[in-house]
Structure formats: C-alpha cells, structure tokens
Interface confidence: medium
C-alpha cells in the first residue's frame, strides 16, 4: 500500500506512517515503529501539556513568586498549568499575571463603582449631585449626604462632592 | 561502533525455557527500540519480538505470543528474551538486533543458537 501523506486527528506524520498523538499530561519518548506504538510518559511532578501531543519535554508550571506579589490561585496538574493571581489589594498587571500593583484608591470627590479583584483595578466615578466622598479609598462608594429634612433641621452649608451638608437647627419665630 | 552480543543460547527439552540475553555498547541503548529476530534451518529471517527504547510499548510474532517475554534494562545496556514452553519449531538461531525495521536489517549480533529437542 502506498504510504499516507495524512493522519487521522490525534495522529502524526512520520517514517511514512501515521503515529498516535501522546494524550494530555504526558510527552513523547519514541515514535511508533511497523511493530510498536508511540511511547508516552507521564509529565513528572510540576510539569504539565494541555494537548494531543509529540513533545519531547513537559512545560514547567507557572511559578507564583510571592517577591512579585503572586500566590497560586488553581494548582496546575499533569495537564494544566498552574493561575496565578495577587495577594489582597493588589491585582495583575497582565491578562497573563505576571506580576502585581496595588489596588489603586479613589480620590475625594470619587467613589469606588467597582471593587478591584485579583485581576481588575478598582473603578472609580466621580460622586454626583447628592453624594460624596470625603477620603482616598479602594473600597467606600460614594454617600448620599444627610438628609437635614428628616431630621427636622435645615441646610445650613451645602454638600460638594467632597463634604457632606452640614446641617443646623431651625431659625426659631420671635413673638 | 555498535557491538551487539547475544548469549543464553543452548539445548533445551520441549517445554523448557531459557533466557536470552544480548549486552549492546557503541550508541545510546535507550534511546533505540532494540528487537528479536531467527531463523531455522533452511529458512529467512522472522522477527520475534520488538521493544520500545523505555520498554512500554512492545510486539509479539503470533507464533509466540503468550511464551515469549521481551524487556530491556537500559542501566546496564542489555536487552533480554524469556522463552517460555519451548516448541521444537523455535529451534533457531537468535539475533539481537537495533533500530528493528521489516525492510531493513541495521545492526546485528551474531546470534546464539537456540535447540528445542528431547
């Protein structure tokens, strides 16, 4: 028979003839022979391959180095790597998460919309009318200021993005 | 340059067993699938058995299947061959071979005769 000059999926090319792919968590020793399969070994420990594969070497799992602000968010496996994410307050730099930065804070006058996750910086918005924010943080949203009506007292200096209202008590009739 | 040395060989009654063994030196033995091959009297060569360079993946001619053991020991370059329930018909001389091909013959030892006979 003529020799293939293509191979069935999780196969390869090679010496004329169609060889098993290794499968996933395991690299490739030997290719096939006319008398024997591919040979396959397990990726050792720490080692990994995510496909149908001929590699000779297993990839090396992701190091998380705690220097960088890194700790292990999924432990890899024969055939995953390891994710990576950053410690509490701070996030990736990368979609790869290579390294971490401090969670940014928002300013005065800005509050949090979106609280920073391992992988996302904090969003910040700027307090509207009616809210305010009076410190520099990651976490606190804006607040509404005081509402002096509820509490039978009147405005006695207006709120800013920055300073809540300050309230007073009512100007009393004189007889 | 490749040397391989088969030994074990002898005289053995029908349904004995007896242990082939072929030291390889010249080349890196475990990187190579190492095989068996003989031939009888007044016949061509046939192929025994066939191993991977680590020994996981393995062939058996049908005619020994189930009585024959192929298995290496890369740590000491050295190949083997378990002959279970010898036949009369396995008399032959044994050859260790590298790099085994069915079209091809690399390198070969310079067998040791095996004869099943009571």
């Known amino acids: 028979p003529e020799p293939p000059t293509a191979c069935r999926e999780k196969q390869y090319l090679i010496n004329s003839q169609c060889c098993s792919l290794c499968q996933p968590g395991q690299k490739l020793v030997s290719d096939c022979t006319e008398f024997t399969e591919t040979e396959c070994l397990p990726c050792g420990e720490s080692e990994f391959l995510d496909t149908w594969n001929r590699e000779t070497h297993c990839h090396q799992h992701k190091y998380c180095d705690p220097n960088l602000g890194l700790r292990v968010q999924q432990k890899g496996t024969s055939e995953t790597d390891t994710i990576c994410t950053c410690e509490e307050g701070w996030h990736c730099t990368s979609e790869a998460c290579e390294s971490c930065v401090l969670h940014r804070s928002c300013s005065p006058g800005f509050g949090v919309k979106q609280i920073a996750t391992g992988v996302s910086d904090t969003i910040c918005e700027p307090c509207p009318v009616g809210f305010f924010s009076n410190v520099s943080s990651a976490f606190e949203k804006c607040h509404p200021w005081t509402s002096c009506e509820t509490k039978d007292l009147v405005v006695q200096q207006a709120g800013t993005n920055k300073t809540d209202v300050v309230c007073g008590p009512q100007d009393r009739l004189r007889a | 340059e490749v040397q391989l040395l088969e030994s074990g060989g002898g005289l053995v009654q029908p349904g004995g067993s007896l242990r082939l063994s072929c030291a390889a030196s010249?080349?890196?033995?475990?990187?190579?699938?190492m095989g068996w091959a003989r031939q009888a009297p007044g016949k061509g060569l046939e192929w025994v058995s066939v191993?991977?360079?680590?020994?996981?993946?393995?062939y058996y001619a049908d005619s020994v299947k189930g009585r024959f053991t192929i298995s290496r020991d890369n740590s000491k370059n050295t190949l083997y061959l378990q002959m279970n329930s010898l036949r009369a018909e396995d008399t032959a001389v044994y050859y260790c071979?590298?790099?085994?091909?069915?079209?091809?013959?690399?390198?070969w030892g310079q067998g040791t005769l095996v004869t099943v006979s009571s």
């Open positions: 071979a590298k790099s085994p091909s069915r079209h091809r013959f690399d390198y």
């Open positions: 010249g080349f890196t033995f475990s990187h190579y699938h």
């Open positions: 191993i991977g360079p680590r020994g996981i993946s393995t």
